[in-house]
């Protein structure tokens, strides 16, 4: 039975040209995290594998940095980066947990961070 929950940074906004940290946290389970995938819509941005470390998609290497922790840093943001991002936790023995973050990249300097929320 999957008892864990994913806490994410939720709905967030950031300024064009700036950077943002995407963070997810898996709690309420003793399952072992074997791999975390970061995806934007259907595109794989990066993987952090417990044994093999990080691999950043070559297509995103210049604008994506690993960390902090299991999170992902997006740099040199453009308005095209607006959209849904997913952290996919592969765990043993529970299986897969998915968290969702919505990022809005703003032209102006009124970007503010949204509240944290949980996805069961």
């Amino acid at each position: 039975m999957m008892t864990g929950t994913i806490e994410t940074t939720g709905n967030i906004s950031a300024e064009k040209g700036g950077s943002i940290i995407l963070q997810c946290h898996l709690s309420s389970t003793t399952a072992q995290v074997t791999q975390v995938n970061w995806e934007q819509q259907d595109q794989l941005l990066a993987i952090c594998n417990a044994d093999l470390g990080w691999h950043i998609s070559p297509s995103f290497k210049d604008r994506v940095a690993p960390g902090p922790g299991l999170g992902l840093t997006l740099q040199s943001l453009t308005v095209n980066d607006t959209g849904e991002y997913f952290c996919i936790y592969h765990t043993y023995p529970d299986g897969t947990y998915t968290g969702r973050i919505f990022l809005e990249v703003l032209e102006s300097s009124v970007a503010e961070h949204g509240a944290r929320f949980q996805i069961p």
Epitope: T34, Q35, L44, I47, N49, A50, D51, L52, G53, H55, I56, S57, P58, K61, H90, Y92, T96
Partner: antibody, heavy 117, light 107 residues
């Protein structure tokens, strides 16, 4: 197009070190991807040995960890394999390969290394 | 280590036949599996990754399927250039491991 080419001595004596070079053309090894060494034993058994990432991090097969070192020379766009204390069991064809998410999308032609006294 | 068991070890087939190679994995690896083809005296070539995605330039007669612990590679209408040895490989942990290969020979 990216191309990889292995080079090094074809014959190594037991207990010595095996050193191979992979020359990469058509792509900078510091741009992206991981850069791997894989070997094919007589009998057609493939073994992954380890890799160096574009940023210089290394990951090795635990079965080889005490004997293996992978480094790179970014100015020459080369990466290297060093395997210490070789035995006849290390006789194989050695390949360098480019890795994307830990599968191998471009391979060198391979170089045969025989360990014999 | 994750063990990869390929079957059959070898098979004989004629041009135009359909062949299927299977790869059984000792642990659940989701879809993190690749297939390679190696011809005599040449280096392996990537055919399929993520269990079912065809690599660039690979003919559509090749197809991959499966997830978890059971995977297969199917070749429809075998062509003369398809004879060789096929390997599966997982990309889910250290060490990365390969199957022992399936040799596809001309009947």
């Amino acid at each position: 197009d990216v191309q990889l080419q292995e080079s090094g001595p074809g014959l190594v004596k037991p207990s010595q070190s095996l050193s191979l070079t992979c020359t990469v053309t058509g792509y900078s090894i510091t741009s992206a991807y991981d850069w791997h060494w894989i070997r094919l034993f007589p009998g057609h058994i493939l073994e992954w040995m380890g890799y160096i990432s574009y940023s210089g991090n290394t990951i090795y097969n635990p079965s080889l960890k005490s004997r293996i070192s992978i480094t790179h020379d970014t100015s020459k766009n080369h990466f290297f394999l060093k395997l210490n204390s070789v035995t006849t069991e290390d006789t194989a064809t050695y390949y360098c390969a480019r890795g994307s998410f830990w599968y191998f999308d471009v391979w060198g032609a391979g170089t045969t290394v025989t360990v014999s006294s | 280590d994750i063990q990869m068991t390929q079957s059959p070890a070898s098979l004989s087939a004629s041009v135009g036949e359909t062949v299927t190679i299977t790869c059984r994995v000792s642990e659940h690896i989701y879809n993190y599996l690749a297939w390679y083809q190696q011809k005599q005296g040449k280096s392996p070539q990537l055919l399929v990754y993520n269990a079912k995605t065809l690599a660039e330039g690979v003919p559509s007669r090749f197809s991959g399927s499966g997830s978890g612990t059971q995977f297969s590679l199917k070749i429809n209408s075998l062509q003369p250039e398809d004879f060789g040895t096929y390997y599966c490989q997982h990309n889910y942990g250290n060490p990365l491991t390969f199957g022992a290969g399936t040799k596809v020979e001309l009947k």
